[in-house]
Amino acid sequence: EQKLISEEDLAAKKVVLGKKGDTVELTCNASQKKNTQFHWKNSNQIKILGIQGLFLTKGPSKLSDRADSRKSLWDQGCFSMIIKNLKIEDSDTYICEVENKKEEVELLVFGLTANSDTHLLEGQSLTLTLESPPGSSPSVKCRSPGGKNIQGGRTISVPQLERQDSGTWTCTVSQDQKTVEFKIDIVVLAFQKASSTVYKKEGEQVEFSFPLAFTLEKLTGSGELWWQAERASSSKSWITFDLKNKEVSVKRVTQDPKLQMGKKLPLHLTLPQALPQYAGSGNLTLALEAKTGKLHQEVNLVVMRATQFQENLTCEVWGPTSPKLTLSLKLENKGATVSKQAKAVWVLNPEAGMWQCLLSDSGQVLLESNIKVVPTWPTPVQP
């Protein structure tokens, strides 16, 4: 004969938050540490599981194939229910009946997913959507790997992803003073640097490197380097290439300059020599397979030339230099110096000795070229 359970036998309802796809354990303890009869039911009073004799029995609920109990803890008076592979619709009030007592546990299951692929190009937007049970009013707070905090309700939006947003985002869902934490791995597809400048003396070899800020097991796409020489009126495609499983293969390359491109990542290009006509800026684009948009990296080449013609010593630079850069001509071990915030400096009738041409930024030397000035003897007058 079933004994009716009075209101005072009903313990205060507990709230448990669960994550979609995870496992949750709803606890239920008897006052006596011994094996006794118990049942777990849902809010519709449908039996989920319980004990019959010494055996675990399951009822006709939708949870029957995902619900279980720790038999090893029964003789300690612990009659928990474990639910595997949680679903949002598992959110419900579950009732444990043991020793003529009822324990109610409210289970709220949440899911947090990225609306699109978790591999996104720099500048693209990321939207995280919270799945929650009807009637709940959760709040969400996410922290990016770079320490950026974003709050929201059912959705959280990051309008423009940056390189530093790559990594594990930690999102905390709060409901009824309880929290559950989600971790979402976001990969921002970008080059490590947005822009880089290479400073070279005329005639030196030039190496451009374009390291990626991410790693993928299979990396496939195509790319191109467009170059705008300072002296040219329009830009020109220097090289086009394909990327298949991290192998770079050149498709088309300009004949001047004679570029070479490495077949391994990171993307790497070499020019046999820096010449004033190559000074300028380039834009390397990389389109990845199955991704809309392109990755970009700007690269600049600044070329320096020091020359002596008759009684004029000149130092020039070509390429994109900022107005705050200083160009100087300096005689070694002497005080003689001429400096300008310009792209050319010169000295008339320079003293003999080793002259240095320096391109500097706030005292830091970016590029230097040495030129030896030999003494010029006056030409003897013919009798």
Partner: antibody, heavy 119, light 107 residues
Framework: EVELLESGGGLVQPGGSLRLSCAAS????????MSWVRQAPGKGLEWVSG????????YYADSVKGRFTITSDNSKNTLYLQMNSLRAEDTAVYYC????????????WGKGTTVTVSS | AIQMTQSPSSLSASVGDRVTITCRAS??????LGWYQQKPGKAPKVLIS???SLQSGVPSRFSGSRSGTDFTLTISSLQPEDFATYYC?????????FGQGTKLEIK
Amino acid sequence: EVELLESGGGLVQPGGSLRLSCAASGLTFSTFAMSWVRQAPGKGLEWVSGISGSGENTYYADSVKGRFTITSDNSKNTLYLQMNSLRAEDTAVYYCAKEGYNWNYMDVWGKGTTVTVSS
Amino acid sequence: AIQMTQSPSSLSASVGDRVTITCRASHGIRNDLGWYQQKPGKAPKVLISETSSLQSGVPSRFSGSRSGTDFTLTISSLQPEDFATYYCLQDYTYPYTFGQGTKLEIK
């Protein structure tokens, strides 16, 4: 242990053709890039041709471009070099070599097969 | 194609000597250069990859270094089994190119 075994060498007249094979054992063929390297009698090593692991990309030295074709059959774990319009200067020992993961170096070489082009 | 200029073409040395062989690349090739040893009638064997990575089983007396586009193979103390021909190989880009080789002979 990875092993490479070349075959198909022999004596051929100028203008003739020959197909070299390189059978690989102990590796997943499609994972690695492969190359053919030759050595003329008393001379140094010359890289001849290469193929990516997927078999999609093929590469040739200028000296053989248009005459030689590199292919691979992943199901047979075999690399091939089809040599047409052979010349006396193609006379050499031909080695096949496997590249390391991520193409770091040629880490495994076969013993070589001799090709002699002579009338 | 990238040219690899190897020097010297031959070298006479004694057991215990320190020897260096140099390869110069016509283009920048990063560290994408390997050193190979070949003995008469045998296939080449890799000693060093990526400029300075010693392959397993290769004695530590072999080392590699780079300065710009100049690459060096050093044998710190020659052993009798080191007398062979040495080649550098650039695998930066296709077509790959070998140096002309350095024949190391007993003085």
